[in-house]
């Protein structure tokens, strides 16, 4: 059973199989690819509110802190990602743990993550149609980032 | 021309053509999938150092700066990683952009991103023996984050 | 026509640091990585480092770690190397050569600047 | 890291000759071999990449072949402007290693 991996499926290693020789749960088990973010979620409530925790996973203790929001498309490898939400718009003070320091500004920073989408191969019809990988950037944000603020020049 | 995913090279959707058929040219053309790291760096030496710039890309900003090295295999997809190197032990203060705090943690976030490697498949061998894609998790730091000491209980 | 001009040749003493050019034209410089190779004695070649020009990234030879340091300046198509505490082993000939790309695979340094001569005296 | 070896440091042939230089590399490579030709000057030039593909505008009488840990590069009929120092460099890992070079010179 395999999938035709292509560029805007229309060339690259390729090979194709039928719906029908394809059951979603193996299509499934290959796009799970990464279904976690980075870090553990928080099993307490933390990371929701603009505050740093001294405890628990790393994006509730960040001065910058973020939750994350689960993305699932079934038809995409992976099918799961997870989007970074800043909390706070400036960074939290140290000291206090829940202050914000107008100093600072808590921002995302952004990746374009390649995914792969399942489409139907092209000139394919029917019942038995194949299907392609059809090759995508997809802008994901992995965190959020304390930073200071830019001075333009 | 296609390739076998697999995990562990012994399930999943599969595919698999002779080495002869695909040409590395081919195979790279996808495992090309992500070759940027998630910013662009500091034109400049800025993250080099332990300081937070006021200009420049978002990890030569943040009081918890890195810069990003290259983790490159051609039989990787995707071929190039980027792996984060924080710079600073402690977070740079926001006032001043140089001097560290000792009460924030410069500290990398980490992910188990999935990757596959071009693998010879079970019970092949000869010239023209094909190739799969065996799954893994790779361990890669995608940025350095600011955070308060655990504290323990 | 792709083309990497290098900097002069440089005469420096023992002990000081040094950065050579190297501008790129005929091409978008962000598109390709730059690599550098150093060439003593006329004869081996040994792979310094490389730099992709679009982000910074960059992946050093374990030899060069903390001799080499890799720039660019985006704004004038310029990659550099900075060489730190020279010695008489650093006296060579130290090339920029572009890294072939065909949109998806880096293959071969396809281009490569005339070489810079940094003789340590 | 990968050693590569040119077991022959230089070599003398005549005008017109078919001439081979080998490269071997400590381990298998994949095929992730490229050869590179430089001049008295200085001045170096990609010739093949990936074991046998010419890259633009190198003249056809240079070929490559291989596999595994041995690779070599032909000359099929040698010219005047192919008295050079060749090199083959190895892209299966990082560092990227070349061998020492392989000179050429007429008889």
């Known amino acids: 059973v395999s999938l035709r991996i292509q560029e805007g499926c229309s060339h690259l290693p390729s090979c194709c199989p039928s719906k029908e020789q394809e059951p979603p749960e193996e299509w499934l088990k290959w796009s799970s690819a990464s279904v976690s973010p980075p870090e553990p979620l928080s099993h307490t409530h933390h990371a929701e509110s603009c505050r740093a925790s001294k405890d628990g996973p790393l994006n509730s203790r960040a001065i910058s802190p973020w939750s994350y929001e689960l993305d699932r498309d079934l038809n995409r490898v992976p099918q799961d990602l997870y989007h970074a939400r800043c909390l706070c718009p400036h960074c939290v003070s140290l000291q206090t743990g829940s202050h914000m320091d107008p100093l600072g500004n808590s921002v995302p920073l952004y990746h374009n993550q390649t995914v792969f989408y399942r489409r139907p191969c092209h000139g394919e019809e029917g019942t038995h149609r194949r299907y392609c990988l059809e090759r995508r950037l997809y802008r994901v944000s992995l965190a959020c980032v304390c930073v200071r603020p830019r001075v333009m020049a | 021309v296609s390739l076998r995913i697999q995990e562990g090279c012994s399930h999943l959707p599969s595919c698999c053509p002779s080495k002869e058929q695909e040409p590395p040219e081919e195979w790279l053309k996808w495992s090309s999938a992500s070759v940027s790291p998630p910013e662009p760096l500091s034109h400049t030496h800025h993250a080099e150092s332990c300081r937070a710039s006021k200009d420049g890309p978002l990890n030569s900003r943040a009081i918890s700066p890195w810069s990003y090295e290259l983790d490159r295999d051609l039989n990787r997809v995707p071929q190039d990683l980027y792996h984060a190197r924080c710079l600073c032990p402690h977070c740079v203060s926001l006032q001043t952009g140089s001097h560290m705090d000792p009460l924030g943690n410069s500290v990398p976030l980490y992910h188990n991103q999935t990757v596959f490697y071009r693998r010879p498949c079970h019970g092949e061998e000869g010239t023209h023996r094909r190739y799969c894609l065996e799954r893994r998790l790779y361990r890669v730091s995608l940025a350095c984050v600011c955070v308060r000491p655990r504290v323990m209980a | 026509e792709v083309q990497l001009q290098q900097s002069g040749p440089e005469l420096v003493k023992p002990g000081a640091s040094m950065k050579i050019s190297c501008k790129a034209s005929g091409y978008s410089f962000t598109d390709y990585t730059m690599n550098w190779v150093k060439q003593s004695h006329g004869k081996n070649l040994e792979w310094i480092g490389l730099?992709?020009?679009?982000?910074?990234?960059?992946s050093y030879n374990q030899n060069f770690k903390g001799k080499a340091t890799l720039t660019v300046d985006k704004s004038s198509s310029t990659a550099y190397m900075e060489l730190l505490s020279l010695t008489s082993e650093d006296s060579a000939v130290y090339y920029c050569?572009?890294?072939?790309?065909?949109?998806?695979?880096?293959?071969?340094?396809?281009?490569w600047g005339q070489g810079t001569s940094v003789t340590v005296s | 890291d990968i050693q590569m070896t040119q077991t022959t440091s230089s070599l003398s042939a005549s005008l017109g000759d078919r001439v081979t230089i080998s490269c071997s590399a400590s381990q298998g490579i994949s095929n992730y071999l490229n050869w590179y030709q430089q001049k008295a000057d200085g001045t170096v030039e990609l010739l093949i990449y990936y074991t046998s593909s010419l890259h633009s505008g190198v003249p056809s009488r240079f070929s490559g072949s291989g596999s595994g840990t041995d690779y070599s590069l032909t000359i099929s009929n040698l010219e005047p402007e192919d008295i050079a120092t060749y090199y083959c460099q190895q892209y299966s890992k990082l560092p990227y290693t070349f061998g020492g070079g392989t000179k050429l010179e007429i008889k």
């Open positions: 050569a572009r890294e072939g790309y065909d949109g998806y695979l880096y293959f071969a340094m396809d281009y």
């Open positions: 730099i992709n020009p679009y982000n910074g990234g960059t």
